[in-house]
Amino acid sequence: PEPPTACREKQYLINSQCCSLCQPGQKLVSDCTEFTETECLPCGESEFLDTWNRETHCHQHKYCDPNLGLRVQQKGTSETDTICTCEEGWHCTSEACESCVLHRSCSPGFGVKQIATGVSDTICEPCPVGFFSNVSSAFEKCHPWTSCETKDLVVQQAGTNKTDVVCGPQDRLRA
């Protein structure tokens, strides 16, 4: 639009002046005036600001508390926050990853559809007909029943979703 109907994108209005915002990684020390420019200062160690801003204080980097099962995935900079993830075998309880819980195991009769990551839990699925799982595991998929035929054996005991079939020798034909 012409003429302008607001301050420019990286500016803010204060005391009739359109002042420059501080760039990411810096905080506001003093507003611009008719005589002076906006004064900004870099954020300190372990602090950040991730947007153009007029904040007088930088934000503290997130602390990845090992007591909560957390570890640093990506170290923060003056422009970005620290990113936490969970220790091996654990996953975040929320998107913000403020604490961790142990990966769930899939009970017998269920197999792992998707192995857990640092941010998502194990996904289990019931073993369909022809498959079984006889252990509680965070890694094991449903296994197919043993094929007795390929071993020249016969099914002696039918399989379930928790047990494999039991194979045995074929009955001898009587004379």
Partner: antibody
Framework: QVQLVQSGAEVKKPGASVKVSCKAS????????MYWVRQAPGQGLEWMGW????????TYAQKFQGRVTMTRDTSISTAYMELSRLRSDDTAVYYC??????????????????WGQGTLVTVSS | DIQLTQSPSFLSASVGDRVTITCRAS??????LAWYQQKPGKAPKLLIY???TLQSGVPSRFSGSGSGTEFTLTISSLQPEDFATYYC?????????FGQGTKVEIK
């Protein structure tokens, strides 16, 4: 303090291109629009257009459309104005100027509060 | 494009004189007008913006007035350092045009 320092004088042949630089210091470069104005010898001032240093988006005066390119490098707080297919009547001093905006009576009033020292571009065969 | 016509184009005056320069716009521009001073071989310097607001650091002998199509720049008591060329600029409609200039010379 705010300073806009431009590149040195250039002599070019008709049909050639020239690229003038304008290095800003003393303020947040991406926070203020940068304008280009030229002045032919003994003549008045002519507005050429502007660039938003944050996004890099330029706006050109109709007269220069197709011949002028305004760019910037935020890493070195420098704006550039390139004029192509030069003619003898492009001989002029080229200025960069920073926009300031004042708010009063419900309106936003722009003006050019800081200017570069000027770059003389001479086009001669 | 909006045309700005300054009058006079040349002006001879003495130190201490009150000087008035007029700038007329070809159409209404509200208060979107600035005044600049330019000395030979130098870049223009902002004096007045929003038609009547004095730029910081500019002596109070300079003043601006007007709105719509007619504007004036007044120097209440001309000083030796004021001998220069003065330009008005409209910032209402692109392209942001300038007046042709008024040269203030020593009488």
């Amino acid at each position: 303090q705010v300073q806009l320092v431009q590149s040195g004088a250039e002599v070019k042949k008709p049909g050639a291109s020239v690229k003038v630089s304008c290095k800003a210091s003393g303020y947040t470069f991406a926070g203020y629009y940068m304008y280009w104005v030229r002045q032919a010898p003994g003549q008045g001032l002519e507005w050429m257009g502007w660039i938003n240093p944050d996004s890099g988006a330029p706006t050109y005066a109709q007269k220069f459309q197709g011949r002028v390119t305004m760019t910037r490098d935020t890493s070195i707080s420098t704006a550039y104005m390139e004029l192509s297919r030069l003619r003898s009547d492009d001989t002029a001093v080229y200025y960069c100027a920073r926009e300031k905006i004042y708010y009063g009576s419900g309106n936003y009033y722009p003006s050019f509060d800081y200017w570069g020292q000027g770059t003389l571009v001479t086009v001669s065969s | 494009d909006i045309q700005l016509t300054q009058s006079p184009s040349f002006l001879s005056a003495s130190v201490g004189d009150r000087v008035t320069i007029t700038c007329r716009a070809s159409q209404g521009i509200s208060s979107y007008l600035a005044w600049y001073q330019q000395k030979p071989g130098k870049a223009p310097k902002l004096l007045i913006y929003a038609a009547s607001t004095l730029q910081s650091g500019v002596p109070s002998r300079f003043s601006g007035s007007g709105s719509g199509t007619e504007f004036t720049l007044t120097i209440s008591s001309l000083q030796p350092e004021d001998f220069a060329t003065y330009y008005c600029q409209q910032l209402f409609s692109y392209p942001w045009t300038f007046g042709q200039g008024t040269k203030v010379e020593i009488k």
